[in-house]
Interface confidence: low
């Protein structure tokens, strides 16, 4: 699942990386754009074992993975909030 | 203000079924991303997991405990419960219930506890 | 499942002194740049309290006399300085593998 929050809570993410996850291993993804109360953009990928990584937004892998899911939900589901499984 | 109590029989016998009860309040585990979970400790001795359950009902077991548990939830009334089937001496101790966190970069570490209710196993 | 050993099994500190805990898992306990290890202090007739987060990351109100440091298979858990009220057992935990596991404790006394 994809998603995109625009919330008024304060940044979420305390540390970020930017290791690969494997996309089998990736339950959902949240963004949350730049703005209330957080001076960038955070990236939150929800993984199936229930952990959850906070990724660094510049991450080539997380980039491209995002372009993918943006292109398979823009024909279907309306921005902001995109819910769809990940293959 | 997040909150949690256990309860329990204080005392049963061998071979019989331990029921337990968490009571919560100050977040419901209806929302994305809440787990409760049960923790047990033998008097003077360390600290063991048993089991918790997420907010999408995913159910999660201590392998050397799994035959005997089984951990439900009932959302609307802000309770978790355990059952231990078949229970011993050794299952004498206290039995914690406890709130997985909720932050984002990971949420399993036990961030709230509830005061414990102790169990004895007694013949 | 992962075993955590801590060590020493007690220590006593001179007040005002540095304490130091160690734990070391029997694999490593990072994922995806996170190392998935937590401490905890228990006092006499109380549960655990969170203390460290995320191997060294302080929870919010624990004074920073508390920190933790670490990464992978092994881990500090240092008290510096030592006052009276962290007299306690201290116990790490990971969560990177179910079944998520606890050390077995350290007792940390004043001198």
């Known amino acids: 699942v994809l998603e995109v929050y625009y919330t008024s809570l304060r940044c979420r993410c305390v540390q970020e990386s930017s290791v690969f996850i494997p996309r089998r291993f990736i339950d959902r993804i949240q963004i949350l754009p730049r703005g209330n109360g957080c001076p960038r953009k955070e990236i939150i990928v929800w993984k199936k074992n229930k952990s959850i990584v906070c990724v660094d937004p510049q991450a080539e892998w997380i980039q491209r993975m995002m372009e993918v899911l943006r292109k398979r939900s823009s024909s279907t589901l309306p921005v902001p909030v995109f819910k769809r499984k990940i293959p | 203000e997040v909150q949690l109590q256990e309860s329990g029989p204080g005392i049963l016998q061998p071979s019989q079924t331990l029921n337990l009860t968490c009571s919560f309040s100050?977040?419901?585990?209806?929302?994305?991303?809440?787990?409760v979970g049960w923790i047990r400790q033998p008097s003077g001795k360390g600290l063991e997991w048993l089991a918790h359950?997420?907010?999408?009902?995913?159910?999660r077991y201590n392998p050397a405990l799994k035959s005997r548990l089984t951990i439900s939830k009932e959302t609307s009334k802000n309770q978790v419960f355990l059952k231990i089937a078949n229970v011993d001496t050794a299952d004498t101790a206290t039995y914690y219930c406890?709130?997985?966190?909720?932050?984002?970069?990971?949420?399993?570490?036990?961030?709230?506890w509830g005061q414990g209710t102790t169990v004895t196993v007694s013949s | 499942d992962i075993v955590l050993t801590q060590s020493p099994a007690s220590l006593a500190v001179s007040l005002g002194q540095r304490a130091t805990i160690s734990c070391r898992a029997s694999e490593s306990v990072d994922n995806s740049g996170i190392s998935f290890m937590h401490w905890y202090q228990q006092k006499p007739g109380q549960p655990p309290k969170l203390l460290i987060f995320?191997?060294?990351d302080l929870e919010s109100g624990i004074p920073a006399r508390f920190s933790g440091s670490g990464s992978r298979t092994d881990f500090t858990l240092t008290v510096n300085p030592v006052e009276t009220d962290d007299v306690a057992t201290y116990f790490c935990q990971q969560s990177n593998k179910d079944p998520w596991t606890f050390g077995g404790g350290t007792k940390l006394e004043i001198k």
């Open positions: 995320r191997a060294s």
């Open positions: 359950i997420w907010w999408d009902d995913d159910r």
């Open positions: 100050g977040f419901s585990l209806s929302t994305f991303g809440m787990g």
């Open positions: 406890t709130r997985i966190a909720g932050y984002y970069g990971s949420r399993d570490w036990f961030a709230y």
